[in-house]
């Protein structure tokens, strides 16, 4: 690993392929910016179980991105 910290992406590593739908409290999409050059899909889990990053290339992530974009635009 390089010793320096690169960017300020919120996700570490590629992320999980899927999260149980029943466990999802909310989903946030972070689009590429000066801080992080990739799209990030962050799932907040129910019952204070923290957060998980979804692999943005996964089927579930693509569905979530589509859903969020439909809602916003």
């Amino acid at each position: 690993f390089p010793m320096f910290k690169r960017g300020r992406c919120l996700c570490i590593g590629p992320g999980v392929k899927a999260v149980k739908v029943a466990d999802i409290e909310k989903a946030s999409i972070m689009y590429p910016s000066n801080n992080c050059d990739k799209i990030e899909v962050i799932i907040t889990l129910k019952e204070n179980k923290g957060q998980r990053c979804l692999n943005p290339k996964s089927k579930q992530a693509r569905l979530i991105i589509k859903k969020v974009e439909r809602k916003n635009f």
Epitope: R6, I12, G13, V19, C53
Partner: nanobody
Framework: EVQLVESGGGLVQAGGSLRLSCAAS????????IGWFRQAPGKEREGVSC????????YYADSVKGRFTISSDNAKNTVYLQMNSLKPEDTAVYYC???????????????????WGQGTQVTVSS
Amino acid sequence: EVQLVESGGGLVQAGGSLRLSCAASGFTFDDYAIGWFRQAPGKEREGVSCCSSSDGSTYYADSVKGRFTISSDNAKNTVYLQMNSLKPEDTAVYYCAATQGLTIATMWNPVSYDYWGQGTQVTVSS
């Protein structure tokens, strides 16, 4: 079956160095973030260093910054923790832990990790 096996602990004098190893098996190394934690007697488990072998991110707790270095050998599926300028307060059992989907907001929380090694004892004498 996922397995994490730590080694390299021992007794060392203050100011000395140790290199811990965490050998991983049973999962695709690049898909996981692997972190190092420690637990001193009577204290909570605390995060020491965290990284991901796929994107090269490295993070350190303030207490070890500049003294500890995390690295990996992907061919050997092994993560290392090089510990220099050791202090008596570094005495603890050191664990490596692995998970997927980690965020920087939750990387120091042991609950965020799915798999743990059995730990290796590090004792620093003054």
